[in-house]
């Protein structure tokens, strides 16, 4: 189809080489009831269509995305770029930053219902640049945490070095929906609830003498509980002696509960004490068996191929640790009578 009639939008993605961030393009087709943009040839050049995320269909995945090769080849279906670029509803997600994402992306409805609809399309010219060292050193992260039950804020990474006073008007989206009341470079949350979690997008317009473009950043916001003030506790083994049969295989499980920590480096290991000696045992990997907002239960097993007389003289110690401290639980084997 002929893309010369498409509305054009320029976007800039400045990515940090230090972080793994993603980017999105919305299919900014207008709402039919608010604009005649899809019947573009009826508009006079002075009439500017209103740009809003596409709401013209009940099924928001009813748009088709294309990529325009720089060499002038025919348009390519965006699905060819899977899994680096993924479409979800009317949004295109770029999973890996890089200048190779620069280019033109076109979206239009899948169902063309009238000859006028052929021109109902948007061409997005995306420029992707790595962040220069000269840029603000302490820019906000693309992953931000909000503490449940407290006040918090979400900052637009591309504007976080500017004061509120000098910041341009910002357009915010959450999970693809326009947040019409938010216009500043920071969203202030009076009390954080679970529903504040999501993918936020902030846009602002930058202009020079020649043209203007939209600078966009994506922020992943997690709602979390506060870091634990407790060291982990061992849930199993509870008893410090265990009845066993000599010559039989044995598995002893150590289950420990770790409170939430933003920087989570849990340690769970087994070691053996034999008179004055002690050594760590090579055991299967630890596994998370339950995870909630507040804590995580991790299990690690020690496996004896067969219980020997020597094992009865040893102590098997489970050691667990987080940033607060450590806990141990030892088990002495006792022959079953």
């Amino acid at each position: 189809f002929n893309i010369s009639g498409c509305s054009t939008k320029k976007l800039l993605w400045t990515y940090s080489t230090r972080s793994e961030e993603e980017f999105v393009l919305f299919c900014d087709l207008p709402e039919p009831q608010k604009s005649h943009f899809c019947h573009r040839n009826r508009l006079s050049p002075k009439q500017v269509p209103e740009h809003l995320p596409f709401m013209g269909s009940n099924d928001l995945s009813d748009v088709q995305w294309y990529q325009q090769p720089s060499n002038g080849d025919p348009l390519e279906d965006i699905r060819k770029s899977y899994p680096h670029i993924i479409q979800d509803k009317c949004t295109l997600h770029f999973l890996t930053p890089g200048v190779n994402n620069s280019g033109s992306y076109i979206c239009r409805p899948k169902m063309i219902k009238s000859p006028y609809d052929v021109a109902c399309c948007v061409k997005m010219i995306l420029e992707v640049k790595p962040q220069t060292n000269a840029s603000c050193e302490y820019s906000a992260s693309h992953k931000q945490d909000l503490l449940l039950g407290s006040t918090g804020s979400i900052s637009c990474p591309s504007l976080s070095c500017q004061s509120d006073a000098q910041s341009p008007a910002v357009t915010w989206y959450k999970n693809g929906k326009l947040l019409s009341v938010e216009r500043s470079n920071r969203i202030v949350v009076d009390e954080v609830y679970d529903y504040h979690q999501g993918t936020y997008v902030c846009d602002y317009t930058q202009s020079d003498t020649v043209s203007s473009w939209t600078v966009r950043a994506v922020v992943q916001v997690r709602t979390i509980v506060g870091d634990t003030k407790l060291k982990p506790d061992i849930l199993d083994p509870v008893e410090d002696t265990l009845e066993v049969e000599l010559g039989k295989p044995l598995t002893i499980s150590c289950k420990a509960r770790f409170g939430f920590e933003r920087v989570f480096n849990p340690v769970i290991k087994w070691y053996i004490k034999d008179s004055d000696l002690e050594w760590e045992v090579s055991v299967p990997e630890a596994k998370s068996i339950k995870s909630t907002l507040k804590d995580e239960i991790i299990e690690r097993n020690i496996i004896l191929e067969k219980v020997t007389q020597r094992d009865l003289r040893r102590k098997f110690v489970c050691f667990v640790q987080n940033s607060i401290g450590n806990t141990t639980q030892s088990v002495q084997l006792k022959e079953k009578r």
């Epitope: 899994p83 993924i86 979800d88 509803k89 997600h93 999501g198 993918t199």
Partner: nanobody, 117 residues
């Protein structure tokens, strides 16, 4: 924290079928994310096999198109992968994970699928 737990793997003859399931621990995280199935064959890197958006749009790598079907049930916080006409080269550990969203990169612990020829 988000926990993902896969099930449904096993040993199957070439040409057979399996259905993998993945249960998530948080509904608010699950429903707003693009979820997917990754696999890692012995001695190879992990690849994204298929993904499904919050609106239900699906994607597949060429090698599984027409044979695998991804689906999700947001009310049950569960992701599925129906695998038909299985081939020996489908043998791998299959992981369910968040492809796009807040917990992007979160993976389950994997379920082994072995296809014997």
């Amino acid at each position: 924290q988000l926990q993902l737990l896969e099930s449904g793997g096993g040993l199957v003859q070439a040409g057979g079928s399996l259905r993998l399931s993945c249960a998530a621990s948080r509904s608010i995280t699950f429903s707003h994310n693009v979820m997917g199935w990754y696999r890692q064959a012995p001695g190879k890197g992990r690849e994204l096999v298929s993904s499904i958006g919050s609106g239900g749009s699906t994607n597949y790598v060429d090698s599984v198109k027409g044979r695998f079907t991804i689906s999700r049930d947001n009310s049950k916080k569960t992701l599925y992968l129906q695998m038909n006409s299985l081939r020996a080269e489908d043998t791998a550990v299959y992981y369910c994970g968040v492809v796009v969203g807040v917990y992007r990169g979160s993976l389950g612990q994997g379920t082994l699928v072995t296809v014997s020829s």
